[in-house]
């Protein structure tokens, strides 16, 4: 019970093209210390969607204030969804390391499907 778990409550989310997609993720613990990252896909070829620590992600906004003390909600919203955004998104907790952070635990993934824009 005490070990950190990564909760991605929706296994699938369907969004119309042009809309925003909210991908929910929360941690059950503040420990271990380290950043959260969102990826599309798994394995070596996965694509970084959001890095809590650094980087510029113009289409991504965080749902809650990540700098807030004791925040455990790392949900994100991706704007202006297109069919190219379809895929499975993983919320991943990293453990702070030196020189590099180490992947600690991943959520189960949320499959994003994109519907045609209503005419």
């Amino acid at each position: 019970e005490d070990e950190l778990q990564v909760i991605q409550p929706e296994k699938s989310v369907s969004v119309a093209a042009g809309e925003s997609a909210t991908l929910r993720c929360a941690m059950t613990s503040l420990i271990p210390v380290g950043p959260i990252m969102w990826f599309r896909g798994a394995g070596a070829g996965r694509e970084l969607i959001y890095n809590q620590k650094e980087g510029h992600f113009p289409r991504v906004t965080t749902v809650s204030e990540l700098t807030k003390r004791n925040n455990l909600d790392f949900s994100i919203s991706i704007s202006n969804i297109t069919p190219a955004d379809a895929g499975t998104y993983y919320c991943v907790k990293f453990r702070k390391g030196s020189p590099d952070d180490v992947e600690f635990k991943s959520g189960a993934g949320t499959e994003l499907s994109v519907r045609a824009k209503p005419s």
């Epitope: 296994k11 949900s75 499959e111």
Partner: antibody
Framework: QVQLVQSGAEVKKPGSSVKVSCKAS????????ISWVRQAPGQGLEWMGG????????NYAQKFQGRVTITADESTSTAYMELSSLRSEDTAVYYC???????????????????WGKGTTVTVSS | DIVMTQSPLSLPVTPGEPASISCRSS???????????LDWYLQKPGQSPQLLIY???NRASGVPDRFSGSGSGTDFTLKISRVEAEDVGVYYC?????????FGGGTKVEIK
């Protein structure tokens, strides 16, 4: 072991609201989805919505959207379901339910309903 | 929303005999991790529902091994190898792949 204790039976007038509580004991409260399921007399089970307290916001079935509010108070390990604009068709037994452990987190299986409350009977009558 | 269809509506059984209930979903409940997000519940008369089978084929804690779940994708079956008198009640399947969770209409199992 995990237990869910629900508030007592209610009799309400059409157009009014009802708020049913569900207190969890045993296990961690914040990390588990609490679902609310209702059963009208002689009818089947109907999922109204659910909340994982750690997120603060709930998911609702479209049928109840705008009429139901599900909340959770982490300080008392209690979930609430409020249904407004009551009509006679809302006469039912309302259950809360939740999973018991986190072993299936890695599978994304959050809405398991291993443990159920005994149900709260809500009667809507003029 | 995913539509769940159960059959039969009513199932008269003889104690000691096997019984089978079918559940069909309007879309596949098989997720990319290989699990089917389909659960089975039994509601005995005057009681709250109780979980029998989760993720398609896994027996819940304390559930007798005469209960088994099978199937994948859109077609699922709950089998009782030898029905006992205490097994009477209404059986429901429910999909847990996505919210809103949706239940089948129920199958009432009664002793002949």
């Amino acid at each position: 072991q995990v237990q869910l204790v629900q508030s007592g039976a209610e009799v309400k007038k059409p157009g009014s609201s009802v708020k049913v509580s569900c207190k969890a004991s045993g296990g961690t409260f914040s990390n588990y989805a609490i679902s609310w399921v209702r059963q009208a007399p002689g009818q089947g089970l109907e999922w109204m919505g659910g909340i994982i307290p750690i997120f603060g916001t709930a998911n609702y079935a479209q049928k109840f959207q705008g009429r139901v509010t599900i909340t959770a108070d982490e300080s008392t390990s209690t979930a609430y379901m409020e249904l407004s604009s009551l009509r006679s068709e809302d006469t039912a037994v309302y259950y809360c339910a939740r999973p018991v452990d986190s072993s299936s987190y890695s599978l994304g299986y959050y809405y398991g309903m291993d443990v159920w409350g005994k149900g709260t009977t809500v009667t809507v009558s003029s | 929303d995913i539509v769940m269809t159960q059959s039969p509506l009513s199932l008269p059984v003889t104690p000691g005999e096997p019984a089978s209930i079918s559940c069909r979903s309007s879309q596949s409940l098989l997720y990319s991790n290989g699990y089917n997000y389909l659960d089975w519940y039994l509601q005995k008369p005057g009681q709250s529902p109780q979980l029998l089978i989760y993720l398609g084929s896994n027996r819940a804690s304390g559930v007798p091994d005469r209960f088994s779940g099978s199937g994948s994708g859109t077609d699922f079956t709950l089998k009782i190898s030898r029905v006992e008198a205490e097994d009477v009640g209404v059986y429901y399947c429910v999909q847990a792949l996505q919210t809103p969770l949706t239940f089948g209409g129920g199958t009432k199992v009664e002793i002949k």
